[in-house]
């Protein structure tokens, strides 16, 4: 029978910007029954707060309401893991909101082929960004990456499609079936999880030849 | 404890590349950006680039673009900056650093000495 | 790019007397968010640079209250209360604001 070993923050997630979840990985547990306790404090305090909601986020986790979320400062924090015979910390973590948003996926996804007398066919592709997404404030830059494959095909083919809610696709199989998804990310943020797939079915007369 | 291992020094000809690694320890690998940052002799520091090993999402400075490349390797918990078309001007410490969740640098690697030279 | 300007160039102060150092930015530092990403690193002799202060005034971790950080706006300062031996070094503004990051020319602190 051990004091518990190191915990470790490992993860920071915010929608949004208005609320966000830490999760912790314990240490070994020596043992025996192990209690977790995060602890915090923000920029230019010293009074140290304990996790307001240890529930939300599942195990391992704090949750910090929109109540308990500033963009204006950052995080201190720490994991304390403790049993009979002692304790450990984790070492200290510092979050910054902005730099830990993972959006909800794109909304909206609609493809089209469009065949223009004149020019090549191409498949156009647009999508809305998530709701919970202010992009109005200005210091919210998402991008965009699309892919889509043939229904019946292992590999997908990916486009990077910067800031645009739109994109247009030259180079595709006639007379196959294609899904096709969107996901964006803030600049310094992660990527958001794929939108529900949208299938299209190309025309056998889709020509790819100039 | 949070540890950042770089490559040994390194000589090279003018038009050639190079290739440093960066190994982390004593945290998850995936979980927080890594930079380069580079220090010619008696100079000032200079921000090459930056990537997040989760899914090496990159950000370069435009100086180096085309001229860097910075990856990871989650299976060995290393990154690597690769600058191309070596001149003499290039000759410089070269550091890695790590960020928290925040867009400023807490741990250094030790640096690695290039020196571009024919 | 945003240019950072130090000065001064280098500093030679007595133990136990008090240093500042100024930086000055191109253009406001102020994020659309509202932060200012503007930090201070010390790079010892022969050593990597390290974190003194983020976010213009916050000490990192283990950094003595010697140190601190003020400023707003383009202009910024970093005071030593009082100058100890082990201060020695090069001391760099940073901001990183605006992509990509940038550094100040650096001020070389020395002990008289």
């Known amino acids: 029978q051990l004091p518990p070993g190191k915990p470790e923050i490992f993860k920071c997630r915010s929608p949004n910007k208005e609320t966000f979840t830490c999760w912790w990985r314990p240490g070994t547990d020596g043992g025996l029954p192990t209690n977790y306790s995060l602890t915090y404090h923000r920029e230019g305090e010293t009074l140290m707060h304990e996790c307001p909601d240890y529930i939300t986020g599942g195990p391992n986790s704090c949750h910090f309401g929109k109540q308990y979320t500033s963009m204006w400062r950052t995080y201190i924090m720490m994991v304390n893991a403790t049993n009979q015979m002692g304790s450990s910390f984790s070492d200290e973590l510092y979050v910054d909101v902005t730099y830990i948003v993972q959006p909800d996926p794109p909304l909206e996804l609609a493809v089209e082929v469009k065949q223009p007398e004149d020019r090549k066919p191409y498949l156009w592709i647009k999508w809305s960004p998530p709701t919970l997404i202010d992009l109005k404030t200005g210091w919210f830059t998402l991008l965009y990456e699309i892919r889509l494959k043939p229904e019946k095909a292992a590999e997908w083919e990916i486009h990077f499609a910067g800031q645009q809610t739109e994109f247009k696709i030259l180079s595709l199989h006639p007379g196959q079936k294609y899904l096709v998804q969107v996901r964006c990310k803030p600049d310094h943020g992660y990527w958001s999880a794929w939108s529900p797939a949208t299938f299209i079915q190309i025309p056998s007369d889709f020509t790819m030849n100039d | 404890q949070v540890q950042l291992v770089q490559s040994g020094a390194e000589v090279k000809k003018p038009g050639s590349s190079v290739k440093v690694s960066c190994k982390a320890s004593?945290?998850?690998?995936?979980?927080?950006?890594i930079h380069w940052v580079r220090q010619a002799p008696g100079q000032g520091l200079e921000w090459m680039g930056e990537?997040?090993?989760?899914?090496?999402?990159?950000n370069y400075n435009q100086k180096f673009k085309g001229r860097v490349t910075i990856t990871a390797d989650k299976s060995t918990s290393t990154a690597y900056m690769e600058l191309s078309s070596l001149r003499s001007e290039d000759t410089a410490v070269y550091y890695c650093a790590r960020s928290f969740f925040t867009n400023w640098f807490a741990y250094w690697g030790q640096g690695t000495l290039v020196t571009v030279s024919s | 790019d945003i240019v950072m300007t130090q000065t001064p160039l280098s500093l030679s102060v007595t133990p136990g007397q008090p240093a500042s150092i100024s930086c000055r930015s191109s253009?406001?530092?102020?994020?659309?968010?509202?932060?200012?990403?503007l930090h201070w690193y010390l790079q010892k002799p022969g050593q990597s640079p390290q974190l003194l202060i983020y976010k213009v005034s916050n000490r990192f971790s283990g950094v003595p209250d010697r140190f601190s950080g003020s400023g707003s706006g383009t202009d910024f300062t970093l005071k030593i209360s009082r100058v100890e031996a082990e201060d020695v070094g090069v001391y760099y503004c940073?901001?990183?604001?605006?992509?990509?990051?940038?550094f100040g020319g650096g001020t070389k602190v020395e002990i008289k």
């Open positions: 940073s901001q990183s604001t605006h992509v990509p990051f940038t």
């Open positions: 004593g945290y998850t690998f995936t979980s927080y950006w």
């Open positions: 990537i997040d090993p989760s899914d090496s999402y990159t």
């Open positions: 253009q406001s530092l102020v994020h659309s968010n509202g932060n200012t990403y």
